[in-house]
């Protein structure tokens, strides 16, 4: 009765700020009636909490039940296969899911031109699920940094990189005209979190943006 089914081979989190998704791989030769039970353990409480008895997808959004992630010691999750009265052993995430596992992203990057400079403003993530007091800048209150990559179009795909310590930055274009494309990757100097490069944001610079001075 107990453990005739094979266990899910792998279970892991992919998480961004207040967007915490658990993923797992299916058991071999699963049937149409195979589903997956998901349970969660909060460090410090040490008892497993059943979250879903029968998920037929291979991922589960745990954001709503891990809202205190940024003020806790973290979580572990486990998944097992269920088929009728049969179930597998549990497969547990092999790392603690904590704030360190959250991939850092930016909400967006806004560009404008002023007197030959490209002025950039990094919008921080504002997820709907985040409690009102848990803003990105309150959770990561110090040492926020951003790597900036600039590409000129047309160009030979060479990049200029710079690191800034503020959400506002300026890029000198050295009098060049054309399209400039910018990407941003966030980091926190005091933490080990991975960062995701933003999607490219582009702006066109023409002669009209330069002020002539004698």
């Amino acid at each position: 009765h107990g453990t005739e089914l094979p266990s899910p081979p792998s279970v892991w989190f992919e998480a961004e700020f207040f967007h915490h998704i658990l993923h797992w791989t299916p058991i071999p030769n699963q049937s149409e009636s195979t589903c997956y039970e998901v349970a969660l353990l909060r460090y410090g409480i040490e008892s497993w909490n059943s979250i879903s008895n029968c998920s037929q997808t291979l991922s589960y959004d745990l954001t709503a039940v891990t809202l205190d992630l940024y003020h806790s010691n973290g979580y572990r999750a486990r998944v097992r296969a269920v088929d009728g009265s049969r179930h597998s052993n549990w497969t547990v995430t092999n790392t603690r899911f904590s704030v360190d596992e959250v991939t850092l992203t930016v909400g967006s990057v806004n560009l404008e031109i002023h007197n030959g400079f490209i002025l950039g403003k990094i919008q921080l993530p504002r997820p709907k699920m985040a409690p009102a007091n848990d803003t990105y800048e309150s959770i990561f209150s110090h040492f926020r940094e951003y790597e900036i990559a600039i590409r000129k179009v047309p160009g030979n795909f060479t990049f200029t990189h710079k690191k800034v310590k503020h959400e506002n930055f300026s890029l000198l274009t050295s009098g060049e005209v054309g399209e400039f494309c910018v990407q941003v990757k966030p980091s926190v100097a005091s933490r080990s979190n991975k960062g995701m490069w933003s999607k490219e944001e582009c702006i066109s610079l023409t002669r009209q943006y330069f002020t002539v001075t004698n």
Epitope: S10, W12, H19, I21, W24, T25, M196, W197
Partner: nanobody, 124 residues
Framework: QVQLQESGGGLVQAGGSLRLSCAAS????????MGWFRQAPGKEREFVAA????????YYADSVKGRFTLSSDNAKNRIALQMNSLKPEDTAVYYC?????????????????WGQGTQVTVSS
């Protein structure tokens, strides 16, 4: 600028094999994983296979399980799809994609970067 470049498509007889490759270029390439989708004429784009960098695991559509094998390199910017025992119903344009969002590996909306596609034709 991130670009995905596919290669390896072509015409093959039913029962034959093909190997598709995909390389991501660009110093600002970030992804949770990479995968393949396909689109046959008049049909929706459908999931074929994907790999997760964090989980180190692969996913396959039921229709290709046991016939297709997805592999990747250690640098996490190149994948290959070995397609064996090909069937006429595998005929489609195959697209390489990079998973940019944390949601399901099976949903095209989780992928932000796409290649131009490579044609695979399986004749009976």
């Amino acid at each position: 600028q991130v670009q995905l470049q596919e290669s390896g498509g072509g015409l093959v007889q039913a029962g034959g094999s093909l190997r598709l490759s995909c390389a991501a270029s660009g110093r600002t390439f970030s992804s949770y994983g990479m995968g393949w989708f396909r689109q046959a004429p008049g049909k929706e784009r459908e999931f074929v296979a994907a790999i997760s960098w964090i989980g180190g695991s692969t996913y396959y559509a039921d229709s290709v399980k046991g016939r297709f094998t997805l592999s990747s390199d250690n640098a996490k910017n190149r994948i290959a799809l070995q397609m064996n025992s090909l069937k006429p119903e595998d005929t489609a344009v195959y697209y390489c994609a990079a998973k940019y969002y944390t949601d399901s590996y099976f949903a095209a909306t989780s992928y932000a970067y796409w290649g131009q596609g490579t044609q695979v034709t399986v004749s009976s």
